[in-house]
């Protein structure tokens, strides 16, 4: 199975009904605290604002946030850890009318209320300590 | 210039006079807080103890520590940040009789007192959010 480059960056337009699907594997054992980060950006530039920031410290915690006009806002933290040490994961982020719903291996694991309209998203970046085998954005058929 | 795989792992034996030299570049702008981590392990396994843990959160801080019998000990933190956003860096870690001396781009930037003998090191791992172009361990000629 061929690997996608990491950091992986792709242009994306999101709206209610869209789903971002990511398949990958941590590059280190959980004892060493590898990270996974998914950022929904407002521009194609990596220094642009972040509508939805999702960061997993494997084996430890997940933090979610937004970066608005260059400043991080109120962080949301979860100790829920459905990821398995050394195992491949499938992550899907669905755009619901009022929030993002994050599924891990088919199990609803995290939610994050919209602070900025999902329509403001222009780019998704997946990065940090993972190998990436799949990235897909599915759009709701109008 | 060809890139080394990251995480990069190499067997190593260290003693007073040894120097570990690393050349690389952060994979993201400092605003996004990419990391660099260098770990001196007691075994070839990544879950082994860590004699010297050196972690840079680019643009923010450096933390140094040891992991002994699976437990992290007293963390040493520095706000000194000689790394440049978007620029290649050369990092050299020299084994002095009583401590590690970390040079960044030829400038002495950090020190870490030996907690465990450097002779206990069997492997060095370089990882997280960097591209790596050089890794070298030089040994003192007896």
């Amino acid at each position: 199975m061929s690997l996608l480059p990491v950091p992986y960056t792709e242009a994306a337009s999101l709206s209610t009904g869209s789903t971002v699907t990511i398949k990958g594997r941590p590059l280190a054992c959980f004892l060493n605290e590898p990270y996974l980060q998914v950022d929904f950006h407002t521009e194609m530039k990596e220094e642009s604002d972040i509508v939805f920031h999702f960061q997993v410290c494997f084996g430890r915690r997940v933090v979610m946030n937004s970066r608005e006009y260059g400043a991080w806002k109120q962080q949301v933290e979860s100790k829920n850890m459905p990821f398995q040490d050394g195992q491949e994961f499938e992550l899907s982020i669905s755009v619901l009318p009022d929030k993002y719903q994050v599924m891990v291996n088919g199990q609803s694991s995290y939610t994050f209320d919209h602070r900025i309209k999902p329509e403001a998203v222009k780019m998704v970046q997946v990065w940090r300590d993972i190998s990436l085998t799949k990235f897909n954005v599915s759009y709701l058929k109008r | 210039m060809s890139l080394l795989p990251v995480p990069y792992t190499e067997a190593a034996s260290l003693s007073t006079g040894s120097t570990v030299t690393i050349k690389g570049r952060p994979l993201a702008c400092f605003l996004n807080e990419p990391y660099l981590q260098v770990d001196f392990h007691t075994e070839m396994k990544e879950e082994s103890d860590i004699v010297f843990h050196f972690q840079v959160c680019f643009g923010r801080r450096v933390v140094m520590n040891s992991r002994e019998y699976g437990a992290w000990k007293q963390q040493v933190e520095s706000k000194n940040m000689p790394f440049q956003d978007g620029q290649e860096f050369e990092l050299s870690i020299s084994v002095l009789p009583d401590k590690y001396q970390v040079m960044v781009n030829g400038q002495s930037s950090y020190t870490f007192d030996h907690r465990i003998k450097p002779e206990a090191v069997k492997m060095v791992q370089v990882w997280r959010d960097i591209s790596l172009t050089k890794f070298n361990v030089s040994y003192l000629k007896r």
């Epitope: - | 002994e68 000990k73 007293q74 009583d98 401590k99 007192d113 206990a120």
Partner: antibody, heavy 120, light 107 residues
Framework: QVQLVESGPGLVKPSQTLSLTCTVS??????????WSWIRQPPGKGLEWMGA???????YYSPSLKSRTSISRDTSKNQFTLHLSSVTPEDTAVYYC????????????WGQGTLVTVSS | NFMLTQPSAVSVSLGQTARITCQGA??????GIWYQQKPGQAPVQVIY???NRPSGIPERFSGSSSGGTATLTISGAQAEDEADYYC??????????FGGGTHLTVL
Amino acid sequence: QVQLVESGPGLVKPSQTLSLTCTVSGGSITTNSYYWSWIRQPPGKGLEWMGAIAYSGSTYYSPSLKSRTSISRDTSKNQFTLHLSSVTPEDTAVYYCARRPNWYRALDAWGQGTLVTVSS
Amino acid sequence: NFMLTQPSAVSVSLGQTARITCQGANLGRYYGIWYQQKPGQAPVQVIYGDSNRPSGIPERFSGSSSGGTATLTISGAQAEDEADYYCQSYESSTSPVFGGGTHLTVL
């Protein structure tokens, strides 16, 4: 030249709490990389490390004494204090305070020691 | 629990070489340290970091470490070297441990 001086009661009753203070002169207990320890030596026996407080205020204790030991500090007086609860006659010893510069080096400066007897 | 084992007593003739050993599983990982203690006095470091001598300690004192054994050597022992000697290392870098002590007699 750093100097350490222990002070406290020479006699403590069983089940009470022993408290000893170490006053440091010639150097600050908050100086980076220094660790301030308590060591004891029962009469005619060997040395036993009890615990330490770091320059940062972090504390470390001997696993065998952890449940009964606490170490605190008063930076304004440049002092650190050992508290040992629920003492028994087996806690009778000369108690030393000492300084350790870092992991590589030894306990390089010691107090003269103070004898504490636990007896009713 | 990590332990450091020393002989309880060692004797040496005046001017001869005395060797005091300290055995412990962690001595391959952590540094060995040696203290001299004379009656009624606080201990004084004579060796740190396996083999380093603090200033003021005579050159006849030396230290070495190999595997799980640290050794204190006194070359040309003097009468004033008669004392108790304690080795110290670490269970982990935040938990110092002492050996049981060795009484050195200079004959």
